[in-house]
């Protein structure tokens, strides 16, 4: 269309970058560069990332998409969010399991494995903090149980058993001699 004045672009901003001969507009997230633009400040030829690949950001030079990660079944990982053209698979642990980092300085990209959460109920204890990012935090013994060593012991149901100091305090009675 004769006479229309083209917008100025100088390759310096985020909008256009020099690709090949010209400053070109980049490809949107989820697309890769098939061919650079064929005129100044033109649109590059961009194609959607194929299945099982992604590109999370607008880009100017990526001529292929990144392969989606597979969650590590050996480490009991599951996919919390499936891979899309714009985002990688988000791996995590299924309900009742928690993330145990394999490195000391743990960040979101660190390798990890999934551990089953402690079942406080099975240990006859109160659940103080539910298991998600770390293991369950169990509290005191449930009613009808008292602390004995590392565990919770059921209150005696008859007078035949002995009931030490802690038992008596929790279970509410002392064996008569």
């Amino acid at each position: 269309q004769g006479g229309t004045r083209s917008p100025r672009c100088d390759c310096a901003g985020d909008f256009h970058k020099k690709i090949g001969l010209f400053c070109c507009r980049g490809c949107p997230a989820g697309h890769y560069l098939k061919a650079p633009c064929t005129e100044p400040c033109g649109n590059s030829t961009c194609l959607v990332c194929p299945q099982d690949t992604f590109l999370a950001w607008e880009n100017h030079h990526n001529s292929e998409c990144a392969r989606c990660q597979a969650c590590d079944e050996q480490a009991s990982q599951v996919a919390l969010e499936n891979c899309s053209a714009v985002a990688d698979t988000r791996c995590g642990c299924k309900p009742g399991w928690f993330v145990e980092c394999q490195v000391s300085q743990c960040v979101s990209s660190s390798p990890f494995y999934c551990q089953p959460c402690l079942d406080c109920g099975a240990l006859h204890r109160h659940t103080r903090l539910l298991c998600s990012r770390r293991d369950t935090d169990c509290g005191t013994c449930l009613p009808g149980f008292y602390e004995h060593g590392d565990g919770c012991v059921s209150c005696p149901t008859s007078t035949l058993g002995s009931c030490p100091e802690r038992c008596a305090a929790v279970c509410g009675w002392r064996q008569m001699f």
């Epitope: 269309q1 004769g2 006479g3 004045r5 083209s6 001969l21 005129e39």
Partner: antibody, heavy 123, light 111 residues
């Protein structure tokens, strides 16, 4: 003094292949985009291919796309044109040209040309 | 593709006279206020030579009798006073967008 010297032309049968070379001297080869332009006997000029400086992206018209490839070896100051699946209509003198960029407008003009090399496609 | 059409196809001009060659693009070759087109001269048996770039800028070493004008879609190459060595074919070419395209050429002869 800028010099461009083409070589590799000759007689080839239809369907055959040929690789043209262009030896450059007298300028910083790696800093320039480079082109091939052809001229059929008694006819006008036709752009065949361009390769960018730096990232070496290549460009072709539809008439040669998927048959020709352009490449460069900056360490040897040499431009190449690989021509496959040649046809009778590819018969022409092939010129190598330097593309000079003017100003900040991403505007190119071919400011130096070689003498050309003749490619004849015939059975 | 942008089609470049030159007129006339051939031209005969007397020595010392003005020669004018026209070139029309099928769409505008303007970008950011610059006309992305150039003129080449090709003498018999020689490669083309750049004469004019950006429609009106004379390449260094080219005699000042050569000039270019025009914008948008219509362009003119003018030789103010024809010399014997100006006998050649003249081509316009656009660099606005790929594929780069040339005019069909204008053959300039001496009358």
């Amino acid at each position: 003094e800028v010099q461009l010297v083409e070589s590799g032309g000759g007689l080839v049968q239809p369907g055959g292949s040929l690789r043209l070379s262009c030896a450059a001297s007298g300028f910083t080869f790696s800093s320039y985009a480079m082109s091939w332009v052809r001229q059929a006997p008694g006819k006008g000029l036709e752009w065949v291919s361009t390769i960018s400086d730096g990232d070496s992206y290549s460009y072709f018209p539809d008439s040669v796309k998927d048959r020709f490839t352009i490449s460069r070896d900056n360490s040897k100051n040499t431009l190449y044109l690989q021509m496959n699946s040649l046809r009778a209509e590819d018969t022409a003198v092939y010129y190598c040209a330097r593309d000079r960029i003017y100003g900040s407008v991403q505007y190119y003009a071919m400011d130096y040309w070689g003498q050309g090399t003749l490619v004849t496609v015939s059975s | 593709d942008i089609v470049m059409t030159q007129s006339p196809d051939s031209l005969a001009v007397s020595l010392g006279e003005r020669a004018t060659i026209n070139c029309r693009a099928s769409e505008s070759v303007e970008f950011s206020g610059t006309s992305l087109m150039q003129w080449y001269q090709q003498k018999p048996g020689q490669p083309p030579k750049l004469l004019i770039y950006a429609a009106s800028n004379v390449e260094s070493g080219v005699p000042d009798r050569f000039s270019g004008s025009g914008s948008g879609t219509d362009f003119t190459l003018t030789i103010s006073s024809l010399q014997a060595e100006d006998v050649a074919v003249y081509y316009c070419q656009q660099s606005r967008k790929l594929p780069y395209t040339f005019g069909q050429g204008t053959k300039l002869e001496i009358k």
